[in-house]
């Protein structure tokens, strides 16, 4: 886990001729704010795709009023950093979109109006824990200067925030096989949750240090396929010493589960599904209340204040069962495309892609774009054996060579007027409507009928989903 931090240094006219007009005027004072959208790895920069790594919105900047006759200066900026927390590993390569928004503070009916001034996008390589990286991006006549970094939240460390650190228990050395946590030399790597080297495909753990194997696999790290060729009978459980399915009674023979629990075989043992009010390896623990902490894997316990009343466990994603004791096989939904191998890591799903495919779900065909070029800043997107270009704003066609008329599709709703603009299009809404496409009616009380805001946006913020 960690935080991506973005510091905006300046937003103003870029170098060269054709300085932009100030976005604010004496009649229409305004202020700026910024939105950042992050996506992992080689994802498309298309504005519509979700901000899978997260998004953040800045505070509003100071109110600015243009001085008549003066050229547009660098505009006053909001204070502070934009911070995008990430829960899993930092991916190393990421795509970003930074939008500059204008909030007009004139006598608007129904409150302030927002419009998108500029959008910049890029793809970068960045290691967590490194220094601030500086960048300059241009959007039409505007120029945005900013810095960014990714930092890990303790106890995570490393370039991907995947190693854990904790204070050393002894002054001079770390635990067996563990290294000091540079640059925190007074701390040590914490042991991995599972046994170090435990196969992510075929092993899992429920306690630190364990490496329990899925059916068909054996060995200390679950890397050895079970061989049935030298066995008398294809019945479990798996023998630790031979790596062979050995004959013998099944682990559920005689039902080891007490109090009406039902038994099911697992690769190495058995598992009891207990009726409510009982838990434990064999459903032997009874009279349970929430005070006993019967919900596993971060489940939330509700009810059951006294032993006679039942409790209910509300399970977090990925777990089920009356005590959240069962891991959901999320790979059964076959989320990986193009023959990719699905890995359920507990905290996340990962797809291991076949050669020639990439992307979080193996959805990108890597060969399609070989030797292809998209003009005017367009990005080549793989898929289905034929490349296509995701064009920069203002361009279209198969190779982004044609100037697009963004207003041709009449995108402004409710009688709004469309203006072609360097960053796409701008809608001037008819009275009583607001939003990037004039899609939201303004209520008489000043509130807007906006849909539920995505993370990082409050209702009432610009509904320009990326």
């Amino acid at each position: 886990a960690g935080v991506f931090e973005l510091q905006i240094h300046s937003f103003g006219p870029g170098p060269g001729p054709g300085a932009p007009r100030s976005p604010c005027s004496a009649r229409l004072p305004c202020r700026l704010f910024f939105r950042v959208c992050l996506k992992p790895g080689l994802s498309e920069e298309a504005a519509e795709s979700p901000c899978a790594l997260g998004a953040a919105l800045s505070a509003r900047g100071p109110v600015y009023t243009e001085q008549p006759g003066a050229p547009a200066p660098d505009l006053p900026l909001p204070d502070g950093l934009l911070q995008v927390p990430f829960r899993d590993a930092w991916p190393g390569t990421f795509s970003f979109i930074i939008e500059t928004w204008r909030e007009e503070l004139g006598d608007q009916i129904g409150g302030p109006a927002w419009s998108l001034l500029a959008r910049v996008a890029g793809r970068r390589r960045l290691a967590a824990g490194g220094p601030w990286a500086r960048d300059i991006q241009r959007a039409g006549a505007w120029e945005l200067r900013f810095s960014y970094r990714a930092r890990c939240e303790p106890p995570a460390v490393g370039t991907a925030c995947t190693r854990l650190c904790r204070p050393r228990s002894a002054p001079s050395r770390c635990g067996p096989g563990l290294r000091p946590c540079a640059p925190l030399e007074d701390e040590c790597e914490a042991p991995l949750v599972c046994r170090a080297g435990c196969s992510p495909e075929h092993g899992f753990c429920e306690q630190p240090g364990e490496c329990r194997c899925l059916e068909g696999w054996t060995g200390p790290l679950c890397t050895v396929p079970v061989s049935t060729s030298s066995c008398l009978s294809p019945r479990g459980p798996s023998s630790a010493t031979t790596g062979c399915l050995v004959p013998g009674p099944g682990p559920c023979d005689g039902n080891p589960c007490a109090n009406g629990g039902s038994c099911s075989e697992t690769p190495r043992s058995f598992e009891c599904t207990c009726p409510r009010g009982f838990y434990g390896l064999r459903c032997e623990v009874s009279g349970v209340t929430c005070a006993d902490g019967p919900c596993f894997n971060g489940g939330l316990c509700v009810g059951g204040a006294d032993p006679d009343s039942a409790y209910i466990c509300h399970c977090p994603p990925g777990f089920q069962g009356s005590n959240c004791e069962k891991r959901v096989d999320r790979c059964s939904l076959q989320p990986c495309r193009n023959g990719g191998l699905c890995l359920d890591l507990g905290h996340a799903l990962r797809c291991r892609c076949r050669a020639g495919f990439a992307g979080p779900r193996c959805e990108h065909d890597l060969d399609d774009c070989a030797g292809r070029a998209c003009a005017n800043g367009g990005t080549c997107v793989e898929g289905g054996g034929a490349h296509r270009c995701s064009c920069a704003l203002g361009f279209g066609g198969r190779d982004c060579r044609e100037r697009a008329d963004p207003c041709a599709a009449r995108p402004c709703a409710h009688g709004g007027r469309c203006y072609a603009h360097f960053s796409g299009l701008v809608c001037a809404c008819a009275p009583g409507y607001m939003g990037a496409r004039c899609e939201f009616p303004v209520h008489p009380d000043g509130a807007s009928a906006l849909p539920a805001a995505p993370p990082g946006l409050r209702p009432g913020d610009p509904q320009r989903y990326l």
Partner: antibody, heavy 117, light 107 residues
Framework: QVQLQQSGAELMKPGASVTLSCKAT????????IEWVKQRPGHGLEWIGE????????NYNEKFKGKATFTADTSSNTAYMQLSSLTTEDSAIYYC??????????WGQGTTLTVSS | DIVLTQSPATLSVTPGDSVSLSCRAS??????LHWYQQKSHESPRLLIK???QSISGIPSRFSGSGSGTDFTLTINSVETEDFGMYFC?????????FGGGTKLEMK
């Protein structure tokens, strides 16, 4: 400093049982495996098995099943190996070692067991 | 059980020489092979883990290579403190097994 401190030498009679201890200092046991290894002159090193303290996980070499039993007390940071029905073949140096993977990263100084009538 | 065969059984060298010790497995152990040094009346000490990973505190003259069934421990420019027994160990499957050892002695 990471150390595994093993109990002292033992002289036992055939048929008896003995419990050897291995106390870890410099880190806490849960999450790390304790491995037990036997060394006899002319027989090299033999892996007896392993235990994950704080859990029910243990793996035994088939050859030592019924001979060795592993336990651990996480409150005292100590692992134990009981050897039963001793014979002269059990005379050896017994090492404990610690790991969070499968390499034997740190070793105790060894306990010499002599079985003699 | 997986059998590890070390060769040669004894290696006589002069300080300053570079030597290679071999460990061959009866079946593939992937890279789950580790090397240990044991001096007389001392406990074994881990030198290399997972075939080629170096260990903090172990001199850089020790290096490991190989995967599958054939592995090599190389000592560049042997020093007098390096004499003793060297064992390989596989942890790809239970039971873990050790090689019979190579004795490195002074010529």
């Amino acid at each position: 400093q990471v150390q595994l401190q093993q109990s002292g030498a033992e002289l036992m009679k055939p048929g008896a049982s003995v419990t050897l201890s291995c106390k870890a200092t410099g880190y806490t046991l849960p999450g790390y495996w304790i491995e037990w290894v036997k060394q006899r002159p002319g027989h090299g090193l033999e892996w007896i098995g392993e235990i994950l303290p704080g859990s029910s996980s243990a793996n035994y070499n088939e050859k030592f099943k019924g001979k060795a039993t592993f336990t651990a007390d996480t409150s005292s940071n100590t692992a134990y190996m009981q050897l039963s029905s001793l014979t002269t073949e059990d005379s050896a140096i017994y090492y404990c070692a610690s790991t969070y993977g499968t390499s034997l990263d740190y070793w105790g100084q060894g306990t010499t067991l002599t079985v003699s009538s | 059980d997986i059998v590890l065969t070390q060769s040669p059984a004894t290696l006589s060298v002069t300080p300053g020489d570079s030597v290679s010790l071999s460990c061959r497995a009866s079946q593939s152990v992937s890279n789950d092979l580790h090397w240990y040094q044991q001096k007389s009346h001392e406990s074994p000490r881990l030198l290399i883990k997972y075939a080629s990973q170096s260990i903090s505190g172990i001199p850089s003259r020790f290096s490991g290579s190989g995967s599958g069934t054939d592995f090599t421990l190389t000592i560049n420019s042997v020093e007098t403190e390096d004499f003793g027994m060297y064992f390989c160990q596989q942890s790809n499957n239970w039971p873990y097994t050790f090689g019979g050892g190579t004795k490195l002695e002074m010529k």
